[in-house]
């Protein structure tokens, strides 16, 4: 995963909503103990902002060393800065930990831009505002990096919450969450509420701000409104899902649904943008431009480079369309849709114009590695990573930014046929997709 800005075909037919309600998360469902309800100690345990990632406080070693760790559902290594770096206020000092164990093995992780490398070991890890447990987990001690740490981001490491298949150097390195579930009674599930501010935050505001919640082992009802709708995890590597239809202001993009998932679609908290395959991106931008044609914006804006500024408080949200992604449902031929607002896909940027202006970047971008549902999407929703049942749930976030006219939405069910055909089957070549 790259944090920041990462980091033979058939059509799925989106139909009208069905009259009946198909099964989804209800209080009647059998559940593991402690999976639902209130997790007061974990609410508001994230800080940060979409452009630089959301982080949770963790402690590593004995005595415990406190570090801020980026929450990343698009990778599977727990890796922390372990040497001085100009962008790090603190780092993991293995020599000070009596419980550190060296695995005598190196790890090297390249990205499209940048990389990190380090030394593998294990140590005791806990999450102060998480479950009251301590686990021995694999840790990559980052000794060298390039374009990985972000100046001013306030995090010193990364918590990869995806599956072992994409762990580095290979899938034998157990990810943190697997270790947590194996060693404790924490249910195999976590949920994320990422709260975009809707306005730019300066450094002191970020440090003081609440960025959201990571609920480990459960679902907190206070963090969402309406119902949770679930989509299957297609394959346990990234959190891969299947998009079956895309609409801009209710207008179907009318593309072969395989295009939406070429070569995969993933949910990734470590990516800022909604990233779309080239063809889909071009079609989406064309449609968004048409919908917002009362104003014209420079080409560089649509490339995510130039910032458009409006007088503070006068951003014309109404001229920008809503974007709906239809996801495969849990029931055959059933889908549901998640709808985001321009308040999610126009990202506020600080320090570029005067205080009398609000400036934004277009946070939808082109991808050569499939669709990435990054913070832009996740900030609209409470997202449940139900690993135990191999599914991801979406509900409208209680903290999403909206206006008096429109709100983010999770709606269903819809009849959609042949959804399985929307998935793309990646040719099996070793590590073909890991250079993201």
């Amino acid at each position: 995963t790259q944090h920041g800005i990462r980091l033979p075909l058939r059509s799925g037919l989106g139909g009208a909503p069905l009259g009946l309600r198909l099964p989804r998360e209800t209080d009647e469902e059998p559940e593991e103990p402690g999976r639902r309800g209130s997790f007061v100690e974990m609410v508001d345990n994230l800080r940060g902002k979409s452009g630089q990632g959301y982080y949770v406080e963790m402690t590593v070693g004995s005595p415990p060393q406190t570090l801020n760790i980026l929450v990343d559902t698009g990778s599977s290594n727990f890796a922390v800065g372990a040497a001085p770096h100009p962008f790090l206020h603190r780092y993991y000092q293995r020599q000070l930990s009596s419980t550190y164990r060296d695995l005598r093995k190196g790890v090297y992780v390249p990205y499209t831009q940048g990389k990190w490398e380090g030394e593998l070991g294990t140590d005791l890890v806990s999450i102060p505002h998480g479950p009251n447990v301590t686990v021995r987990a694999n840790i990559a001690a980052i000794t060298e990096s390039d374009k990985f740490f972000i100046n001013g981001s306030n995090w010193e490491g990364i918590l990869g919450l995806a599956y072992a298949e994409i762990a580095r150097p290979d899938d034998s390195l157990e990810p943190f969450f697997d270790s947590l579930v194996k060693q404790t009674h924490v249910p195999n599930l976590f949920s994320l509420q990422l709260c975009g501010a809707g306005f730019p935050l300066n450094q002191s505001e970020v440090l003081a701000s609440v960025g959201g919640s990571m609920i480990i082992g459960g679902i907190d009802h206070s963090l969402y409104t309406g119902s949770l709708w679930y989509t299957p995890i297609r394959r346990e590597w990234y959190y891969e899902v299947i998009i079956v239809r895309v609409e801009i202001n209710g207008q179907d993009l009318k593309m072969d649904c395989k295009e939406y998932n070429y070569d995969k679609s993933i949910v990734d908290s470590g990516t800022t943008n909604l990233r779309l395959p080239k063809k889909v991106f071009e079609a989406a931008v064309k449609s968004i431009k048409a919908a917002s044609s009362t104003e014209k914006f420079p080409d560089g804006f649509w490339l995510g480079e130039q910032l458009v500024c409006w007088q503070a408080g006068t951003t014309p949200w109404n001229i920008f369309p809503v974007i709906s992604l239809y996801l495969m449902g849990e029931v055959t031929n059933q889908s549901f849709r998640i709808t985001i607002l321009p308040q999610q896909y126009l990202r506020p940027v600080e320090d570029v114009a005067t205080s009398q202006d609000d400036c934004y970047k277009f946070a939808i971008s082109q991808s050569s590695t499939g669709t990435v549902m990054g913070a832009v999407i996740m900030e609209g929703f409470y997202v449940v990573f139900d690993r135990a049942r191999k599914r991801i749930g979406f509900a409208v976030s209680a903290c999403h930014v909206h206006d008096e006219f429109r709100t983010a939405a999770v709606e269903g069910p819809f009849v959609t046929l042949d959804m399985e055909d929307c998935g793309y089957n990646i040719p099996q070549t070793d590590e073909s997709t890991l250079m993201t």
């Epitope: 104003e295 014209k296 560089g300 130039q306």
Partner: antibody, heavy 120, light 108 residues
């Protein structure tokens, strides 16, 4: 080829409203490819952007002048206009109209400019 | 707010010499920078856009370079008609709004 020409009074009294019009010839203010802008330059000083307008009437203003500026467009006459209220001597300048082209990011064609003096 | 600082304020050179003008942004503007030439009594004229692209009809002796925060306008061999004031302008923030203070290129 496309030309822009500013017109309006060269002398305005303090506290009154400065009004200028830019007439576009050889091109159209209803083009979807351009914004149209006003820039001014006080004598012996640098350039200051005043504001820009699109064919739809959508406007953007310099925050420092926003409370006093109105820019409008009349596509039927192929003109766009500037009004600056409550003027003072500090508003004395050469006023230029310009086309915003090259990906609507730069002022690629300019009028010759008109000097407006604010004095009683 | 992004501030553009041009240096030197005045550059005294002879015809045929090479002129190097600098524009520094207070923060990165990527490649969204233009250069304008203004002769006495005339309107500015666009020379370079997107840091290094010559506008239509601009002679090859004018070239622009740089990205991020540091930009340079180079006139490889000054012609008599090149003595003028040169302004840079950024459009990372849109609409385009910010100009530098200008550099005057005068005859030595």
């Amino acid at each position: 080829q496309l030309q822009l020409q500013e017109s309006g009074p060269g002398l305005v009294k303090p506290s009154e409203t400065l009004s200028l019009t830019c007439t576009v010839s050889g091109g159209s203010t209803s083009s979807s490819s351009y914004y149209w802008g006003w820039i001014r330059q006080p004598p012996g000083k640098g350039l200051e952007w005043i504001g820009s307008i699109y064919r739809s009437g959508s406007t953007y203003y310099n925050p420092s002048l926003r409370s006093r500026v109105t820019i409008s467009v009349d596509t039927s006459k192929n003109q766009f206009s500037l009004k600056l209220s409550s003027v003072t001597a500090a508003d004395t300048a050469v006023y230029y109209c310009a086309r915003v082209g090259h990906g609507i990011s730069y002022f690629d064609l300019w009028g010759r400019g008109t000097l407006v003096t604010v004095s009683s | 707010e992004i501030v553009l600082t041009q240096s030197p304020a005045t550059l005294s050179l002879s015809p045929g010499e090479r002129a190097t003008l600098s524009c520094r942004a207070s923060q990165s503007v990527s490649s969204y920078l233009a250069w304008y030439q203004q002769k006495p009594g005339q309107a500015p004229r666009l020379l370079i856009y997107d840091a290094s692209n010559r506008a239509t009809g601009i002679p090859a002796r004018f070239s622009g370079s740089g990205s991020g925060t540091d930009f340079t306008l180079t006139i490889s061999s000054l012609e008599p008609e090149d003595f003028a004031v040169y302004y840079c302008q950024q459009s990372l923030t849109w609409p385009p709004r910010t100009f530098g203070g200008g550099t005057k290129v005068e005859i030595k």
